[in-house]
């Protein structure tokens, strides 16, 4: 249990297990490392705070190993609080976790998150919370988090993460709960260029969109991508795109490649969509600094576990039963499989 206190009063409590997936350079090329938050991890007192009146918000910094830290910065309004920003700092001079690293520098990566809960209730998420940063994927599991605490203990009530499914209570939190359809159907995608197939994918996609309705209420809705949607794409040396569209929506997935490490990954998501009941019916979002669905070029990335790719505060891309291979696809068939971390557990 991680606690942040001020004058003996606890303002943040958090309990979770965490792992950090990242890549680093060695003389023999790129290495992928998956670091677990050890039992010895503790709150960094001078990096954590209950916030200063009228000046700053509460933050929790957890330190472990040789100078690695995970920081959660909180903010609130009248009815809800959230982890506005998450930072992960890692020290490549830690030979235990980064053997043979060429660089010995300290790197800090950050991302916004969709961790939010009602004031005076704890945030609860049994499922994986995946936060995608530039070169790191942070995975929190079995998380109970609460900031702006009232009496130095977790509150009775809880706000559940959307990936845990419906909350035990039937009453909706504010904003409205996601209107989740059934799981999307697996679709098969194939992008071909002048030099043959550059993308092969089998996956079920779902868009989780948060928007303001005409009545000024915030709603989160899930939209399934149908196998009937039209798919197209393009093959480039450093960029492979897959576009899936229908009359109301155009979703573009952009896969990038790190030439030095021979890794491909989902680098960008762009969505243009019409939401008839929205205050602003034209919904456009893009993020080109993702690092998801990552595997070695020539191999395929596979994950049976549902993945939530946080694109922005307004959009999360949920991927089910995915197998994808980009840039180098031989004989129109998937290559060797690289399974996601969570399938291995």
């Amino acid at each position: 249990l991680f606690e942040v206190k001020n004058n003996g009063t606890t303002c943040i409590m958090a309990s979770f297990s965490a792992s950090f997936l990242t890549t680093y350079e060695t003389a023999n090329g790129s290495q992928i490392v998956n670091i677990s938050l050890p039992a010895s991890a503790e709150v960094l007192k001078n990096g954590s705070s209950c916030g200063k009146e009228n000046v700053s918000d509460p933050s929790l910094t957890i330190t472990f190993g040789r100078g690695h830290t995970l920081t959660l910065n909180f903010t609130r309004n009248a009815t809800r609080y959230s982890v506005q920003h998450m930072y992960f700092t890692y020290n490549l001079s830690d030979t235990e976790h980064f053997p043979n690293a060429i660089s010995k520098e300290i790197y800090t990566m950050d991302s916004t998150t969709d961790i939010r809960a009602d004031i005076d209730k704890k945030y609860r998420c049994v499922s994986d919370i995946r936060v995608y940063m530039k070169n790191v994927t942070v995975v929190l599991r079995d998380a109970t988090i609460q900031a702006y605490l009232s009496n130095s203990s977790f509150s009775r009530g809880e706000t559940h993460c959307t990936q845990d499914g419906p909350s035990p209570t039937t009453g909706p939190p504010s904003p409205s709960p996601p209107l989740v359809p059934t799981n999307p159907t697996v679709s098969k995608y194939n992008v071909t260029g002048n030099n043959g197939t550059c993308l092969l994918a089998s996956m079920a996609l779902q868009l989780n969109i948060t928007y303001l309705k005409k009545d000024n209420k915030t709603v989160t809705r899930a939209f399934n991508i149908s196998p009937n949607d039209t798919s197209s794409g393009s093959c480039g040396i450093n960029l492979v795109t897959l576009k899936v569209e229908n009359k109301n929506r155009a979703l573009e997935l952009q896969f990038g490649m790190n030439a030095s490490s021979s890794l491909f990954f989902l680098q960008g998501v762009r969505l243009n969509m019409t939401l008839p009941d929205a205050l602003v019916p034209t919904f456009s979002i893009s993020n080109h600094s993702l690092k998801a669905l990552q595997a070695t070029v020539g191999n395929s990335y596979k994950c049976n576990t549902e993945e939530h790719i946080f694109v922005s505060k307004m959009l999360s891309l949920n991927v089910f039963s995915v197998q994808v291979q980009a840039f180098k696809v031989d004989s129109d068939r998937f290559g060797s499989v690289e399974e996601c971390v969570q399938d291995g557990n």
Partner: antibody, heavy 118, light 106 residues
């Protein structure tokens, strides 16, 4: 100890606006929401809205969102409620209230009586 | 907004007797229910929060129970000072008062 001191009674004409204040003391002003509640003989107690002084975020009851405007001044630890386009229906006692976290509305101001009359 | 339906609007009971007031929410409020006593010329007074937890200094003659959408509030051994209007308040999702129950002594 927590104290909420409200401004004095107001006699106003129909169609006019009124702005009342609520000065908080005895706690860190930006840590808690301040709520406003209407008490009238016909309707009983009604929640109007709340304001989080830390950033001015203010959710309103559907019934009052076009009637009331809540603001807060951090420097003086004071919250304000302005009521517009007043009618006789708005004649009531208005309370500012502080919740004790999840212990509902624990601290009440002494109330401001608003009388709307031509 | 969540709607709260409080009943009865008024009731009359004898000293030493017992009364029960009910509140029904338009959706599950997860036991985030409070009860208030309101007397003329005074500010409302919090009696019970979290459905059944008595505020410090409130006599045990007052009690509350319920879950989901249905909640009740009781006063036993009625005393003259209990003459007041009683309100329920949900604070699970924003805040909503019930319509009130005016208690009179026969």
């Amino acid at each position: 100890q927590v104290q909420l001191q409200q401004s004095g009674a107001e006699l106003v004409k129909p169609g006019a606006s009124v702005k009342m204040s609520c000065k908080a003391s005895g706690y860190i002003f930006t840590n808690y929401n301040i709520h406003w509640v209407k008490k009238s003989p016909g309707q009983g107690l009604e929640w109007i809205g709340a304001i989080y002084p830390g950033n001015g975020d203010a959710p309103y009851s559907q019934k009052f969102k076009d009637k009331a405007t809540l603001t807060a001044d951090k420097s003086s630890s004071t919250t304000y409620m302005q009521l517009s386009r007043l009618t006789s229906e708005d004649s009531a006692v208005y309370y500012c209230v502080r919740a004790n976290w999840d212990v509902a509305f624990a601290y009440w101001g002494q109330g401001t009586l608003v009388s709307v009359s031509a | 907004d969540i709607q709260m339906t409080q009943s009865p609007p008024s009731l009359s009971a004898s000293l030493g007797g017992k009364v029960t007031i009910t509140c029904k929410a338009s959706q599950d409020i997860d036991r985030y229910m409070a009860w208030y006593q309101d007397k003329p010329g005074k500010g409302p007074r919090l009696l019970i929060h979290d459905t059944s937890t008595l505020q410090p200094g409130i006599p045990s003659r007052f009690s509350g129970s319920g879950s989901g959408r249905d909640y009740s509030f009781s006063i036993s051994n009625l005393e003259p000072e209990d003459i007041a209007t009683y309100y329920c308040l949900q604070y699970d999702n924003l805040w909503t008062f019930g319509g009130g129950t005016k208690l009179e002594i026969k």
